[in-house]
């Protein structure tokens, strides 16, 4: 490609998190090059012989691909010319975690960057009023988390209050024996107040809010990946 070792291009990666049992994306960008046939993208994983994925001359080359990644990887081919070398990973597994290298060679030069890929499980919590309890309580459930998260409750009215004495949290292993269902019950809740159930591990933080009034129940939930 007429590259001397002196020419380096900027390659940028972002710490990514993969939700096991879903498709994931390992993010990598580079200085664009309109000459698609001159672009080589190689993804490597620390401790793995062979490649995770290779894209060159405008198409995939899987001849050197490691068995662990067969049938599971893809680049966004139509976005390569604009500098997107991100890798799509099908059906993320716990074992996909690790350090990856995104290596790029173009007609302008070459460069690489490492990426720490974390894998785990995270899901939105759902809060419901538990009318079966002797006193009104709230039940916060999230179907899939790993590693085991921490759960905390907060309330708009009693800001800063510690609810650990009036809540009970349990973790139930799911059928695939990796992820767990999170259930937390908050007792003695009062109406006309907004309560929040916060679930967090080193990969993600999820919050479910519920506002209970005499006439209605309003819910909201959000999920945020950490260090991404």
């Amino acid at each position: 490609f007429g590259i001397s070792g002196k020419h380096f291009i900027t390659v940028t990666t972002f710490t990514s998190a993969g939700n096991i049992g879903e498709d994931g994306t390992l993010s990598c960008t580079f200085e664009p090059d309109i000459k698609l046939n001159g672009i080589v993208i190689q993804w490597l994983k620390e401790g793995i012989k062979g490649l995770v994925h290779e894209f060159k001359e405008g198409k995939d080359d899987l001849s050197q691909q490691h068995e662990m990644f067969r049938g599971r990887t893809a680049v966004f081919a139509d976005q390569v010319v604009v500098g997107n070398a991100s890798l799509r990973l099908k059906n993320v597994q716990l074992t996909d975690a690790g350090t990856y290298t995104c290596y790029i060679r173009t007609s302008k030069g070459k460069g690489n960057a490492n990426l720490e890929y974390k894998t785990g499980a995270f899901s939105m919590p759902e809060i419901n009023v538990d009318y079966n309890a002797s006193s009104e309580s709230l039940r916060c459930e999230a179907p899939r988390w790993f590693p085991q998260p921490t759960v905390a409750w907060a309330s708009q009215v009693d800001q800063g209050a510690n609810f650990s004495e009036v809540s009970n949290t349990s973790f139930e292993l799911n059928s695939e024996n990796v992820t767990m269902k999170v259930v937390s019950v908050l007792y003695n809740v009062t109406i006309n107040n907004t309560y929040s159930c916060m679930i967090e591990n080193d990969i993600a933080k999820a919050t479910g809010d519920i506002k209970v009034t005499d006439s209605e129940v309003k819910r909201r939930s959000q999920l945020q990946l950490l260090n991404s």
Epitope: R72, D78, N91
Partner: antibody, heavy 115, light 109 residues
Framework: EVQLVESGGGLIQPGGSLRLSCAAS????????MNWVRQAPGKGLEWVSV???????YYADSVKGRVTISRDNSKNTLYLQMNSLRAEDTAVYYC?????????WGQGTTVTVSS | EIVLTQSPGTLSLSPGERATLSCRAS???????LAWYQQKPGQAPRLLIY???SRATGIPDRFSGSGSGTDFTLTISRLEPEDFAVYYC??????????FGQGTKLEIK
């Protein structure tokens, strides 16, 4: 032995409902991408729906809003709830596991929609 | 939506001959996400090739897959009587999540 066995097919009137089941053995349904694929008489294969290990679901446009894919992890079984059935839903319905591709298929169950 | 077009629709060959089946995508498909299946009458499909070129477990080496981008090929180097069937290519990963080609019928000449 890794195996999928479908059941629940039959003759149903247009507008009716049916629930197909797919019992898995030899592997865990909740760890895999599980699909329903159908084949109308004398026609090719048509993808219907998938449920990811995470529980996320996707549907083909032709069935969206009329079918629901689900699973019972404790029974290691995949389901397809079909509502508002039409004549064009007549087909053999297969469940299939997707790892690197659809490597395990059931024998299929026949759904006939007719008045 | 990605459309997969298989050709020819029907291929008439004799045992011992070489069969070449084509699958063309309307837009680029990742090689990793391209698979080939064989289906015989009254039977479920069987995975032959995944990742465009990797043979599935138990598949004889007379079956091979190649191609990338929009053009993929399934080759059967020397046809055996049990190879006469319908063959489908399939892609994963774009909306709709999975797409099958319309199939190629391989029949005995």
């Amino acid at each position: 032995e890794v195996q999928l066995v479908e059941s629940g097919g039959g003759l149903i009137q247009p507008g009716g409902s049916l629930r197909l089941s797919c019992a898995a053995s030899g592997f865990t349904v909740s760890s895999n991408y599980m699909n329903w694929v159908r084949q109308a008489p004398g026609k090719g294969l048509e993808w219907v729906s998938v449920i990811y290990g995470s529980g996320r679901t996707y549907y083909a446009d032709s069935v969206k809003g009329r079918v629901t894919i689900s699973r019972d992890n404790s029974k290691n079984t995949l389901y397809l709830q079909m509502n508002s059935l039409r004549a064009e839903d007549t087909a053999v319905y297969y469940c299939a596991r997707d790892t690197y591709a659809m490597d395990v298929w059931g024998q299929g169950t026949t759904v006939t929609v007719s008045s | 939506e990605i459309v997969l077009t298989q050709s020819p629709g029907t291929l008439s060959l004799s045992p011992g001959e070489r069969a070449t089946l084509s699958c063309r995508a309307s837009q680029s498909v990742s090689s990793s996400y391209l698979a080939w299946y064989q289906q015989k009458p009254g039977q479920a499909p069987r995975l032959l090739i995944y990742g465009a070129s990797s043979r599935a477990t138990g598949i004889p080496d007379r079956f091979s897959g190649s191609g990338s981008g929009t053009d993929f090929t399934l080759t059967i180097s020397r046809l055996e009587p049990e190879d006469f069937a319908v063959y489908y290519c399939q892609q994963y990963g774009s909306s709709p999540m999975y797409t099958f080609g319309q199939g190629t019928k391989l029949e005995i000449k």
